[in-house]
């Protein structure tokens, strides 16, 4: 009778992770007697995936009832695969003996290979905010995906940006992979609203890649202008003079006005309104009675904007242009929380 | 569901011979490899032996080679463990268990003159 | 034959605390054929872990299995009050087939 052979007919089989890997195997003959055992790898160090006859392998099931009588077919499935069981699988007959069972003979291996999609990208800016003008990182990262070609672009409010390097890890074979890219972005004053984009195609995706995002607005800092102005009397020796925050982001901002250098008041940006390009703008106001003065008035509009160093502007109001009451010490009417009267 | 039964406990005198059936359900015992392993009393677990019930091919320990013998009869599913020649050490727990994954609730034999 | 060597015999932990448990193989053992088995008093014992690393079903994931060769270990991150209990390791890798002597890990 001819020599027992077996057959392992697929050189290898593709299967994407989480899904049922089917390995197939069968003998040409019911002699020696002995069991099948499958493996992975060869030599020594080879892992044991399936006995028939003992051992715990939850995952293994027999496509045919291995124990039937004249049974020659010794296939197996492998359920919810992942990378990590990528590799060649050995269907190996054994022959009984004593002590252990002897391998009898092998097949010629099928190579189990996995493709898994890439986890979704997440994309991470700097950790301080920068102003326009800068060039900042964005870092993109995906995990876990197999085989190791894969296509990463960047994108700034559905432009392609072309300066970045992205690395691909590991460089050898393994069983699955991550790819890490770092984008430069230069920022600019209408950037609150833009986003950047992350995109990774791979086989695994069918065509529809994977995008993580960063909004610019955790990025940018958008330093305000300031305009001092003296608006026209409002009544008999009243001044209003005002303080025009513009264009500034984020809205964290303190205001102080200093008369001749010293502190009058302090106030958070409450109510501001929001420009079209996200930016927001406020603006501060104080009632000064000039006829408390004798001398010119030097008032000064104060901004510490997101923590920065303060910044500020200055106004010299000339108290000779009016008529003076002298020793006079009425207050003005305080008609608005913004207003301030001076003595 | 996998189970495997065992019969009661035995009180045997020294130089009588126990047998010891496990009778299995939930699947066919020619499938697997059934190992039967001693537990004496505080002591460890220490392996018997197997039998392959599809060609009734057996594996010993050196320690019971000769007094032990392991059948198993495919019509009834069930498995069995003979010790001969028996002495107060082989007083102890005997399991049978499913190809190393599933345990008998085991036996209890006491070798007691 | 193949003698395995567990130690401690005997380990002392609180709750919460980290065990870990160890087996030495007398020669080579794949990781394939090494198991773990946990028996409670007046129970059979019960698969825990095969293949060296991989729990049984229903095992909690504080429990671990690592190894190689003749060096085995069963860890386990923090300490339940269920997880009091004796551990074997067991080789089947060539007959006859043989048991550790067992590691006690009990209530300190």
């Known amino acids: 009778e001819e020599e027992l052979q077996v057959i392992q007919p697929d050189k290898s089989v593709l299967v994407a992770a989480g899904e049922t890997a089917t390995l197939r195997c069968t003998a040409t003959s019911l002699i020696p007697v002995g069991p099948i055992q499958w493996f992975r790898g060869a030599g020594p160090g080879r892992e044991l995936i399936y006995n028939q006859k003992e051992g715990h392998f939850p995952r293994v099931t027999t496509v045919s009832d291995l124990t039937k009588r004249n049974n020659m077919d010794f296939s197996i499935r492998i359920g919810n695969i992942t990378p990590a069981d990528a590799g060649t699988y050995y269907c190996v007959k054994f022959r009984k003996g004593s002590p252990d069972d002897v391998e009898f003979k092998s097949g010629a291996g099928t190579e189990l290979s996995v493709r898994a999609k890439p986890s979704a990208p997440v994309v991470s800016g700097p950790a301080a905010r920068a102003t326009p003008q800068h060039t900042v990182s964005f870092t993109c990262e995906s995990h876990g995906f197999s085989p190791r070609d894969i296509t990463l672009k960047w994108f700034k409010n559905g432009n392609e940006l072309s300066d970045f390097q992205t690395n691909v890890d590991p460089v050898g074979e393994s069983v699955s992979y991550s790819i890490h890219s770092t984008a430069k972005v230069v920022l600019t004053r209408e950037d609150v609203h833009s986003q950047v984009i992350c995109e990774v195609a791979h086989v695994t995706l069918q065509g529809d890649p994977l995008r993580g995002t960063a909004n610019l607005s955790e990025t940018i800092r958008v330093p305000p202008t300031l305009e001092v102005t003296q608006q026209p009397v409002r009544a008999e020796n009243q001044v209003n003079v005002t303080c025009q925050v513009r264009k500034f982001y984020p809205q964290r901002l303190q205001l102080t006005w200093l008369e001749n250098g010293n502190v009058s008041r302090t106030e958070t940006a409450s109510t501001v309104t929001e420009n079209k390009d996200g930016t927001y703008n406020w603006m501060s106001w104080l009632l000064v009675n000039v006829s408390a003065h004798r001398d010119d008035v030097k008032l000064t509009c104060q901004v510490e904007h997101d923590g920065q160093p303060a910044v500020s502007k200055s106004h010299d109001l000339k108290v000779s242009a009016h008529p003076k009451e002298q020793g006079s010490n009425t207050a003005a009417e305080n008609t608005g929380s913004n207003e301030r009267n001076i003595y | 569901e996998v189970q495997l039964v065992q019969s009661g406990a035995e009180v045997k005198k020294p130089g009588a011979t126990v047998k010891i059936s496990c009778k299995v359900s939930?699947?066919?015992?020619?499938?697997?490899?059934m190992h039967w392993v001693q537990q004496a009393p505080g002591k460890g677990l220490e392996w018997i032996g197997r039998?392959?019930?599809?060609?009734?091919?057996?594996k010993y320990a050196p320690k019971f080679q000769g007094r032990v013998t392991i059948t198993a009869d495919t019509s009834t599913n069930t498995a069995y463990m003979e010790l001969s020649s028996l002495r107060s050490e082989d007083t102890a727990v005997y399991y049978c268990?499913?190809?190393?994954?599933?345990w008998g609730q085991g036996t209890l034999v006491t070798v007691s003159s | 034959e193949i003698v395995l060597t567990q130690s401690p015999a005997t380990l002392s932990l609180s709750p919460g605390e980290r065990a870990t448990l160890s087996c030495s193989a007398s020669?080579?053992?794949?990781?394939?054929?090494l198991y773990w088995y946990q028996q409670k008093p007046g129970q059979a014992p019960k698969l825990w872990i095969y293949?060296?690393?991989n729990l049984a079903s229903g095992i909690p994931a504080r429990f671990s299995g690592s190894g190689s060769g003749t060096d085995f270990t069963l860890t386990i991150s923090s300490l339940e009050p269920e997880d009091f209990a004796v551990y074997y390791c067991?080789?089947?890798?060539?007959?006859?087939?043989?048991f550790g002597q067992g590691t006690k890990l009990e209530i300190k």
């Open positions: 067991h080789q089947w890798s060539s007959y006859p087939y043989t």
């Open positions: 039998i392959d019930p599809e060609d009734a091919e057996t």
């Open positions: 020669s080579s053992v794949s990781s394939s054929y």
């Open positions: 939930g699947f066919n015992i020619k499938d697997y490899y």
């Open positions: 293949s060296t690393s």
């Open positions: 268990d499913r190809g190393l994954a599933y």
